[in-house]
Amino acid sequence: MMTGTIETTGNISAEKGGSIILQCHLSSTTAQVTQVNWEQQDQLLAICNADLGWHISPSFKDRVAPGPGLGLTLQSLTVNDTGEYFCIYHTYPDGTYTGRIFLEVLESSVAEHGARFQIP
């Protein structure tokens, strides 16, 4: 039985032109993480393999940076980056765990305005 749970940053918003960190954390399992895939809809952004390290997809090399940790940093955000992102943890012996993050990229003034009214 798979006992683990994935905690994510959930629904997040960021400013156009800025950057954002996508973070997931796997807990409540002794399973060993062998690889984490980061995907946007059906597109592979990056892979972090426990043995081979990071691989960033060529089409995202300019705007995606590995880390911190198993997370992923998206830079030079555009409105087109709005959407769902998935962290896919490949583990042994549990198998695959998937976490979902929704990112909304806002025009600068909207993002600033929204930030004032965020619930802490």
């Epitope: 039985m1 798979m2 399973a31 060993q32 393999n49 426990a50 043995d51 012996p93 198998g95």
Partner: antibody
Framework: QIQLVQSGPELKKPGETVKISCKAS????????MSWVKQTPGKGLKWMGW????????TYADDFKGRFAFSLETSASTAYLQINNLKNEDTATYFC????????WGQGATLTVSS | QIVLTQSPAIMSASLGEEITLTCSAR?????MHWYQQKSGTSPKLLIY???NLASGVPSRFSGSGSGTFFSLTISSVEAEDAADYYC????????FGGGTKLEIK
């Protein structure tokens, strides 16, 4: 290339102890769990459990709790299976296998328990 | 613990024949892996994660299925395919099927 090399055949008497080794090479040892599988003559495969090579924490399948112990010598990239108080029914081939979808297995270590 | 049942236990096939080996799970599993084992050797991975062909495995082997029913198909049996075949799942508590012995007529 990736290899798992196990120790040689063992002939033991009931009540004795055996320690089977599995030396890994060609990859970062602590990146993948190591599991152990038992195969009795002419029978199928039975998962015994696994050890997290990063944390050193072992997990045993229900039928292998008590007399069985998994351990590591991380500096030598080696995993061990120890069986205490051997019984005739422990006669089998024991495989180590890397915990991923790569399909990497040791060649098997044959244990014969006989008085 | 998920019990895997393979059928048939023994199968006899002619050269060039297409055959399908099945593996049913007592409860739903996300992925199935298939191994081939010849006498005196360690199991060899054929298919991983239900339908992916392992490196170096001939394309006559294929896998499919979902939930509680999975299958391994050999599109055109060759003499070297005589072996035992096992399905294997993880899902927290790994288990193997009882195996299917493939004999060539």
């Amino acid at each position: 290339q990736i290899q798992l090399v196990q120790s040689g055949p063992e002939l033991k008497k009931p009540g004795e102890t055996v320690k089977i080794s599995c030396k890994a090479s060609g990859y970062t040892f602590t990146a993948y769990g190591m599991s152990w599988v038992k195969q009795t003559p002419g029978k199928g495969l039975k998962w015994m459990g696994w050890i997290n090579t990063y944390s050193g924490v072992p997990t045993y399948a229900d039928d292998f709790k008590g007399r069985f112990a998994f351990s590591l010598e991380t500096s030598a990239s080696t995993a061990y299976l120890q069986i205490n108080n051997l019984k005739n029914e422990d006669t089998a081939t024991y495989f180590c296998t890397r915990g991923d979808t790569g399909g990497y297995w040791g060649q098997g270590a044959t244990l014969t328990v006989s008085s | 613990q998920i019990v895997l049942t393979q059928s048939p236990a023994i199968m006899s096939a002619s050269l060039g024949e297409e055959i399908t080996l099945t593996c049913s799970a007592r409860s739903s599993v996300s992925d199935m892996h298939w191994y081939q084992q010849k006498s005196g050797t360690s199991p060899k991975l054929l298919i991983y994660s239900t339908s992916n062909l392992a490196s170096g495995v001939p394309s006559r082997f294929s896998g499919s299925g979902s939930g509680t029913f999975f299958s391994l198909t050999i599109s055109s049996v060759e003499a070297e395919d005589a072996a035992d075949y096992y399905c294997h799942q993880w899902g927290g508590y790994p288990t193997f099927g009882g195996g299917t012995k493939l004999e060539i007529k």
